[in-house]
Interface confidence: medium
């Protein structure tokens, strides 16, 4: 079936930076994050707070994978783990674990990747668009449904 | 049938309960983009309280509206334009 115009919140392929305090190297890994569209609405009623809760795209089930960072000094554990989204959901943003906000302007990939992860046999997916603006549907790579 | 994974656009909809014949009350509803991903180390360093996940979101909100009084004498915002913008009520 044709690719949806506004795909629902789901796991998408992404290229992320993996680094660690004390290690000189930043490497790029292929993983999945959660992205897509969630339904919201605005109240018409006056003088009432809070408004209807607004759900946003969040992790649901996550697997953690580990990777070894090269070049870490002695005494620094070179193993670092990163999240792989297995499933996603439209839900309230959990403040306890999540920085909840609007579009950010930080890059998700290494500024100067000195090593490219080659542990994945598949071709690396397109990296995330610059998060200085939220991508529209045409920007959003999706996993096969 | 449309793809079941598609999400309807953020648009004006007529509220069936507050509308009267000839006097529709319009309300913004629909879908907006958001994403969640592991917080990059560089961002974590700037956080007072470190969070493992970063969420970037937009929500369907009124871009413009008129305040009107409907039957029963209560006030509502009759939305006139919608867009995907800042979420205010998305945290738990």
């Amino acid at each position: 079936s044709k690719e949806p115009l506004r795909p629902r919140c789901r796991p998408i392929n992404a290229t992320l930076a993996v680094e660690k305090e004390g290690c000189p190297v930043c490497i790029t890994v292929n993983t999945t994050i959660c992205a897509g569209y969630c339904p919201t609405m605005t109240r018409v009623l006056q003088g009432v707070l809070p408004a209807l809760p607004q759900v946003v795209c969040n992790y649901r089930d996550v697997r953690f994978e580990s990777i070894r960072l090269p070049g870490c000094p002695r005494g620094v554990n070179p193993v670092v783990s990163y999240a792989v989204a297995l499933s996603c959901q439209c839900a309230l943003c959990r403040r306890s674990t999540t920085d909840c906000g609007g579009p950010k302007d930080h890059p998700l990939t290494c500024d100067d990747p000195r090593f490219q992860d080659s542990s994945s046999s598949k071709a690396p997916p397109p990296s995330l668009p610059s998060p200085s603006r939220l991508p529209g549907p045409s920007d959003t790579p999706i996993l096969p449904q | 049938a449309p793809d079941v994974q598609d999400c309807p656009e953020c648009t004006l909809q007529e509220n069936p309960f507050f509308s009267q014949p000839g006097a529709p009350i319009l309300q913004c509803m629909g879908c907006c983009f958001s994403r969640a991903y592991p917080t990059p180390l560089r961002s974590k360093k700037t956080m007072l309280v470190q969070k493992n996940v970063t969420s970037e979101s937009t929500c369907c909100v009124a871009k413009s509206y008129n305040r009107v009084t409907v039957m029963g004498g209560f006030k509502v915002e009759n939305h006139t334009a919608c867009h995907c913008s800042t979420c205010y009520y998305h945290k738990s």
Epitope: L45 | P8, E14, N15, P16, M29, G30
Partner: antibody, heavy 118, light 111 residues
Framework: EVQLQQSGPELVKPGASVKISCKAS????????MHWVKQSHGRSLEWIGY????????GYNQRFNSKATLTVDNSSSTAFMEVRSLTSEDSAVYYC???????????WGQGTSVTVSS | DIVLTQSPASLAVSLGQRATVSCRAS??????????MNWFQQKPGQPPKLLIY???IQGSGVPARFSGSGSGTDFSLNIHPMEEDDTAMYFC?????????FGGGTKLEIK
């Protein structure tokens, strides 16, 4: 956790009235429309009407205009429905339901059974 | 009032198989890109539970095996794979116009 707790079953005589309550908890009562739905003999569902607790306006299905009256007591976060001039046709389970996103009825009370019998 | 006609009235499906319930509206329930069609599940002695809204959006906590599709006047609810716990009555509901109306219900059982 959102909960709607309805009053117990009622056995009433034809011609009498009955007032059913629906106590809300786990959310701000005045922020959401409350709907009432009738279910006869375990099958068909009929919308009776709604009330907006914050300022009290109501809307009714024309079929129930002179049959049901919806009210609220915001101090106790309770919605009420009075059904009058009862006949055997009014024997049913009555539900209250909160209105959520996209006008859905997202949380329901457990239902109140009303039996009209002489 | 908008009349909703559900079919079939009853349906028996084997565990693990697909169950499809249909709902036809007497007029379109679409408005500006949104189909105001909802689906509810009701088990004996319990209130209805919201499964799907806006034709295809899953309600909170609803398992992924429930999906909805359709637009205009023709809608369907799919359950796949069918589980023991899915034995229930299923109702469609339109909320485009007042009064909101419900379909007559489909009784789903295990074959």
């Amino acid at each position: 956790e959102v909960q709607l707790q309805q009053s117990g079953p009622e056995l009433v005589k034809p011609g009498a009235s009955v007032k059913i309550s629906c106590k809300a908890s786990g959310y701000t009562f005045t922020d959401y429309n409350m709907h009432w739905v009738k279910q006869s003999h375990g099958r068909s569902l009929e919308w009776i009407g709604y009330i907006y607790p914050y300022s009290g306006p109501t809307g009714y299905n024309q079929r129930f205009n002179s049959k049901a009256t919806l009210t609220v007591d915001n101090s106790s976060s309770t919605a009420f429905m009075e059904v009058r001039s009862l006949t055997s046709e009014d024997s049913a389970v009555y539900y209250c339901a909160r209105e959520g996103i996209f006008y859905t009825m997202d949380y329901w009370g457990q239902g109140t059974s009303v039996t009209v019998s002489s | 009032d908008i009349v909703l006609t559900q079919s079939p009235a009853s349906l028996a499906v084997s565990l693990g198989q697909r169950a499809t319930v249909s709902c036809r509206a007497s007029e379109s329930v679409d408005n500006n890109g949104i189909s105001f069609m909802n689906w509810f599940q009701q088990k004996p002695g319990q209130p209805p539970k919201l499964l799907i809204y806006a034709a295809s959006i899953q309600g909170s906590g609803v398992p992924a095996r429930f999906s909805g599709s359709g637009s205009g006047t023709d809608f369907s609810l799919n359950i796949h794979p069918m589980e023991e716990d899915d034995t229930a009555m299923y109702f469609c509901q339109q909320i485009k116009e007042v009064p909101p109306t419900f379909g007559g219900g489909t009784k789903l059982e295990i074959k």
